[in-house]
C-alpha cells in the first residue's frame, strides 16, 4: 500500500525515487537485527545472508537515489510501511523504528532532520 | 510454552507500599513487552500501562502515573509492579500479561488494602 | 486517550448458535487489537491478537475481523465451555485500553 510521504523538498520526486529502489536488503537487514540471527521471519531466509552483507546491499540499494539525502526520510518511512503488517507487538515496532533511525549512520549517511515514523494511519 | 507465574496475595495497610512479581518462562523474556492490568472486585479490565523489557521503559496509563512503578530484573526474567501509599480502592487483581504473537497472562495478584 | 465500546454488554444464546460481539474504537487503530476471554474466578487469556489471529491452542470455532475503528469476534458454534466474559482491547505503542466487556450466557 503506498501513501502520501515526504515532509522535506520535492516528495513527488522523492516518491519516484524511492519506488524505483530494491528496500528488500534494509528490511531484511532489520529484521535480522531485531529477531536475531537464529530466527527465520517470515517468507524470508534471514539466515541464507549475512548480516553484514545485507546491510551492504541495503547502503547500495539507497545510494541509489539520486538523492539519498534529501529522500532518505521518506526510505525510511517506506521501509515502516512495508514491514508494518508483519510486526507482531508494540515492542516490535519500538526496535524497528529504533533500528530504522540508524540506518543512514550505518551507511555513512547523514541521518534527516526530522523524519515522522508515525505515518501508516494507527497501523504502526 | 510462556509462562507466567506471579507472587502470592498481599494484605496491607492504607498508605503502606507492595510488591507484586512476575516471574517468565518458555520464551526470551526480552523480545516481548509486559502489560501489567488491574482488576477491582466484580469489575472489568483496566489497562495499567506496559514496560518494554528491551530498554526498561515504562509507559503508564494516566490514571496510573505517580504511586506506580514497573521495573524489570531481566537476569531472572523478573517483572515487577511496586505501588505505593496504598489506597483501599487499590484493592484488587493485578494481572501481568505479555503482548504478541504469544500473548499470555499471569494467574493474578490479590492485593487488598484494609486498616 | 483512545475509548473501546463493545457491544452487546450481555448475549444469551444456545449451544450451536454463532455468535458475534463487535468492538468499536474512538480512533483508527489499525489492526492492534486483541481478544479476551476470562471465565469466572480465573485469569483473561488470549484468543486472538493483531485483530484476526487465532492464538496457538485457541479452537477454531473464534475467528476475529476488522480494522481501523470496527472489529468482530466471531463464535461459529457456541459451546457449554464459551461461557465468560470476552474483552477487546487495543494497544498501540502508548495505550492498551480495554472494552467494558460482553458476557456471554447459554440460554
Known amino acids: 500500500m503506498r501513501r502520501e510521504r515526504g515532509r522535506q523538498g520535492d516528495s513527488s520526486s522523492c516518491e519516484r525515487q524511492v519506488d524505483r529502489v530494491n528496500l528488500k536488503p534494509c528490511e531484511q537487514h532489520i529484521m535480522q537485527r531485531i529477531m536475531g540471527e537464529q530466527e527465520q521471519y517470515d517468507s524470508y531466509d534471514i539466515r541464507s545472508t549475512r548480516s553484514s552483507d545485507q546491510q551492504q546491499r541495503c547502503c547500495d540499494e539507497l545510494n541509489e537515489m539520486e538523492n539519498t539525502q534529501r529522500c532518505m526520510c521518506e526510505a525510511l518511512q517506506q521501509i515502516m510501511e512495508n514491514q508494518c503488517d508483519r510486526l507482531q507487538d508494540r515492542q516490535m515496532v519500538q526496535q524497528f523504528k529504533r533500528e530504522l533511525m540508524n540506518l543512514p549512520q550505518q551507511c555513512n549517511f547523514r541521518a534527516p532532520q526530522r523524519c515522522d515514523l508515525d505515518v501508516s494511519g494507527g497501523r504502526c | 510454552q510462556v509462562q507466567l507465574v506471579q507472587s502470592g496475595s498481599e494484605l496491607r495497610k492504607p498508605g503502606a507500599s507492595v510488591k507484586v512479581s512476575c516471574k517468565a518462562s518458555g520464551y526470551t523474556f526480552t523480545k516481548y513487552g509486559m502489560n501489567w492490568v488491574r482488576q477491582a472486585p466484580g469489575q472489568g479490565l483496566e489497562w495499567m500501562g506496559w514496560?518494554?523489557?528491551?530498554?526498561?521503559?515504562?509507559t503508564y496509563a494516566q490514571d496510573f502515573t505517580g504511586r506506580f512503578v514497573f521495573s524489570l530484573d531481566t537476569s531472572v526474567n523478573t517483572a515487577y509492579l511496586e505501588i505505593s501509599g496504598l489506597k483501599a480502592e487499590d484493592t484488587a487483581v493485578y494481572y501481568c500479561?505479555?503482548?504478541?504473537?504469544?500473548?499470555?497472562w499471569g494467574q493474578g495478584t490479590l492485593v487488598t488494602v484494609s486498616s | 486517550d483512545i475509548q473501546m465500546t463493545q457491544s452487546p454488554s450481555t448475549l444469551s444464546a444456545s449451544v450451536g448458535d454463532r455468535v458475534t460481539i463487535t468492538c468499536r474504537a474512538s480512533?483508527?487503530?489499525?489492526?492492534?487489537l486483541a481478544w479476551h476471554q476470562q471465565k469466572p474466578g480465573t485469569a483473561p487469556k488470549v484468543l486472538i491478537y493483531k485483530a484476526s489471529n487465532l492464538k496457538s491452542g485457541v479452537p477454531s470455532r473464534f475467528s476475529g475481523s476488522g480494522s481501523g475503528t470496527d472489529f468482530t469476534l466471531t463464535i461459529s458454534s457456541l459451546q457449554p465451555d464459551d461461557v465468560a466474559t470476552y474483552y477487546c482491547q487495543q494497544y498501540n505503542t502508548y495505550s492498551g485500553t480495554f472494552g467494558q466487556g460482553t458476557r456471554v450466557e447459554i440460554k
Open positions: 514496560i518494554n523489557t528491551n530498554t526498561a521503559k515504562p
Open positions: 480512533q483508527s487503530i489499525g489492526t492492534w
Open positions: 500479561a505479555t503482548d504478541g504473537s504469544e500473548g499470555s
